[in-house]
């Protein structure tokens, strides 16, 4: 249907029981008036899932949907659902006049709109064809996970199924490493879900016949604050020949700011711990996390007395952790050393 | 033992504020879903609000959109309702209720906290 | 007015059997299952029936869900006094502005 004018369904009257849905090719500027229902009882007007407000450029007024001056944004599958009920009273589609791929339908090849998809009676309004696979309405995941929500549903036609988010189309374009439509599994799939990504998501299947929708709701949770968490078997032990360089490293997770220290254990008067039963350590080396190289301490042309145990510290507001290592010393003639060293420590 | 219980209810006046608190025992409070449904004197079960376990998901009832905040703190093991702009026909028992997690039907409910709204 | 549609009031003699109904739409009971709780007087809400038809521990045999369409049901066999209470039906709504509803409520009188 292609209007010079205005585009108008008139009158505003019972709607017919023949929910086909149209496609209307409107012209930039054109006014458009739609009716459903009648006037005193008339139906809700959405678009693309969102409740039009009875005032504004575009509006939904007394089962009237009024465009002053189609615009190109306007393009978009409007509803119209009876007052009280999720009924479809109208179900079309504005197509800008002079841009007919401006319908935005991504969907399943298999859309009821290709015209090869001709179907056998009777029609059916979309069911759900596994209601239990989807009892599980409130979704909690740990941020970085991936999410599933699956709508399976079936209907003659094949229905389509198309995905909001907070009421609105979603299309996964504004977050980082998109979604995943999988239409012939009715399914919706964000991987490394973050607190962004918190919302109602809504599944909307529709035929020609009619339309059903359900929603998921999802919490994300983020990680909990931790002590910074040192990698395992870092630093590892090591052995070097006198004069030669050796390089120890601490890998640190932390969510939170951590703080890192590199120590060296030491002997007082004979001692290697005092009164209060804390180690005598002489601090080598101290900075945050993203000062460069912080997690490598370097020694160079090391002696005997670089020998002994070191020990990576790293703390953030929540608390410290440390592992250690132990450094063999070995005179140039006697490379062949090994040493049976004791097991690096986490503790709080 | 599974325990929730309201506290904060009161008399207020149209246009006033009011949080209520919902402490909980008994179970792991940081991993569920909550809820508050309220009852008007003599009436039936309205929900009003339902909060995620991070706290950082919440939905409301049209009737309290915008007046009404839930919130809550896992570390305090509670669970909140702020209310502002009250009007009279919020006057209500205010229960708070857990969300089983599995089927998401409210499975354990608070004795409730009588808020009135009047002048 | 309710999203789900409860009859007001119910009774019936001690050892009888009643039934209470609760009809909604597509959007509530059609998609969702159904909950059924019970409100003693005075008392909070307590869980009755989960997931259209199963008990929480604790809640006797006689009482029993169903549910076939939009529509639902409770069925309290043996009544007892101790049932004389409200019960109430309830879904998630899968509609555009709701997320749970409720019946209106049923005045279950014990004679």
């Known amino acids: 249907l292609e209007a010079s004018e205005e585009v108008e369904l008139e009158p505003c009257l019972a709607p017919s029981l023949e929910q086909q849905e149209q496609e209307l090719t409107v012209a930039l500027g054109q006014p458009v008036r739609l009716c459903c229902g009648r006037a005193e009882r008339g139906g809700h007007w959405y678009k693309e899932g969102s409740r039009l407000a009875p005032a504004g450029r575009v509006r939904g007024w007394r089962g009237r949907l009024e465009i002053a001056s189609f615009l190109p944004e306007d393009a978009g599958r409007y509803l119209c659902l009876a007052r009280g009920s999720m009924i479809v009273l109208q179900n079309l589609t504005l197509i800008t006049g002079d841009s007919l791929t401006s319908s935005n339908d991504d969907e399943d090849p298999k859309s009821h709109r290709d015209p090869s998809n001709r179907h056998s009676y009777p029609q059916q309004a979309p069911y759900w064809t596994h209601p239990q696979r989807m009892e599980k309405k409130l979704h909690a995941v740990p941020a970085g996970n991936t999410v599933k929500f699956r709508c399976p549903a079936a209907g003659n036609p094949t229905p389509t199924i198309r995905w909001l988010k907070d009421g609105q189309a979603f299309h996964g374009e504004n977050r980082i490493g998109g979604i995943r439509l999988r239409h012939q599994h009715w399914s919706l799939v964000m991987e490394s879900v973050v607190p962004s990504d918190r919302g109602t998501y809504t599944c909307l299947v529709e035929n020609a016949v009619g339309s059903i929708r359900y929603n998921y709701l999802l919490d994300v949770l983020e990680r909990s604050p931790h002590r910074p968490i040192l990698q395992a078997g870092l630093p590892a032990n090591t052995t070097a020949v006198v004069g030669s360089d050796v390089e120890l490293l601490c890998k640190v997770y932390s969510d939170a700011q951590p703080h890192i220290q590199w120590l060296k254990h030491i002997v007082i008067n004979g001692s290697s711990f005092g009164a209060d039963g804390f180690p005598y350590v002489q601090v080598l080396k101290t900075a945050d996390i993203n000062s460069s190289e912080v997690e490598v301490l370097y020694l160079r042309n090391v002696s005997a007395e670089d020998a002994g145990e070191y020990t990576c510290l790293a703390g953030n507001s929540i608390g410290l952790s440390y592992q250690s290592a132990w450094l063999t010393v070995l005179p140039e003639e006697d490379p062949t050393w090994t040493a049976a060293a004791p097991e690096a420590r986490y503790t709080d | 033992e599974v325990q929730l219980l309201e506290s904060g209810g009161g008399l207020v006046q149209p246009g006033g504020s009011l949080r209520l608190s919902c402490a909980a025992s008994?179970?792991?409070?940081?991993?569920?879903?909550m809820a508050w449904v309220r009852q008007a004197p003599g009436k039936g079960l309205e929900w009003v609000s339902v909060?995620?376990?991070?706290?950082?998901?919440?939905v409301y009832a049209d009737s309290v959109k915008g007046r009404f905040t839930i919130s809550r703190d896992n570390s305090k093991n509670t669970l909140y309702l702020q209310m502002n702009s009250l009007r009279a026909e919020d006057t209500a028992v205010y229960y708070c209720?857990?969300?089983?997690?599995?089927?998401?039907?409210?499975?354990?409910w608070g004795q409730g906290t009588l808020v009135t709204v009047s002048s | 007015q309710s999203v789900l549609t409860q009859p007001p009031s119910a009774s019936g003699t001690p050892g009888q059997g009643v039934t209470i109904s609760c009809s909604g739409s597509?959007?509530?009971?059609?998609?969702?299952?159904v909950n059924w709780y019970q409100q003693l007087p005075g008392a909070a809400p307590k869980l009755l029936i989960y997931?259209?038809?199963l008990r929480p521990s604790g809640v006797p045999a006689r009482f029993s869900g169903s549910k076939s369409g939009t529509s639902a049901s409770l069925a309290i066999s043996g009544l007892r006094s101790e049932d004389e209470a409200d019960y109430y039906c309830?879904?998630?709504?899968?509609?555009?502005?709701?997320?749970?509803?409720f019946g209106g409520g049923t005045k279950l009188t014990v004679l």
């Open positions: 209720a857990r969300i089983n997690s599995g089927s998401s039907h409210f499975d354990y």
């Open positions: 008994g179970f792991t409070f940081s991993t569920y879903w």
């Open positions: 909060i995620g376990p991070s706290g950082g998901m919440t």
């Open positions: 597509s959007s509530n009971i059609g998609s969702n299952s």
């Open positions: 997931s259209n038809n």
């Open positions: 309830a879904a998630w709504d899968d509609g555009l502005d709701a997320y749970v509803v």
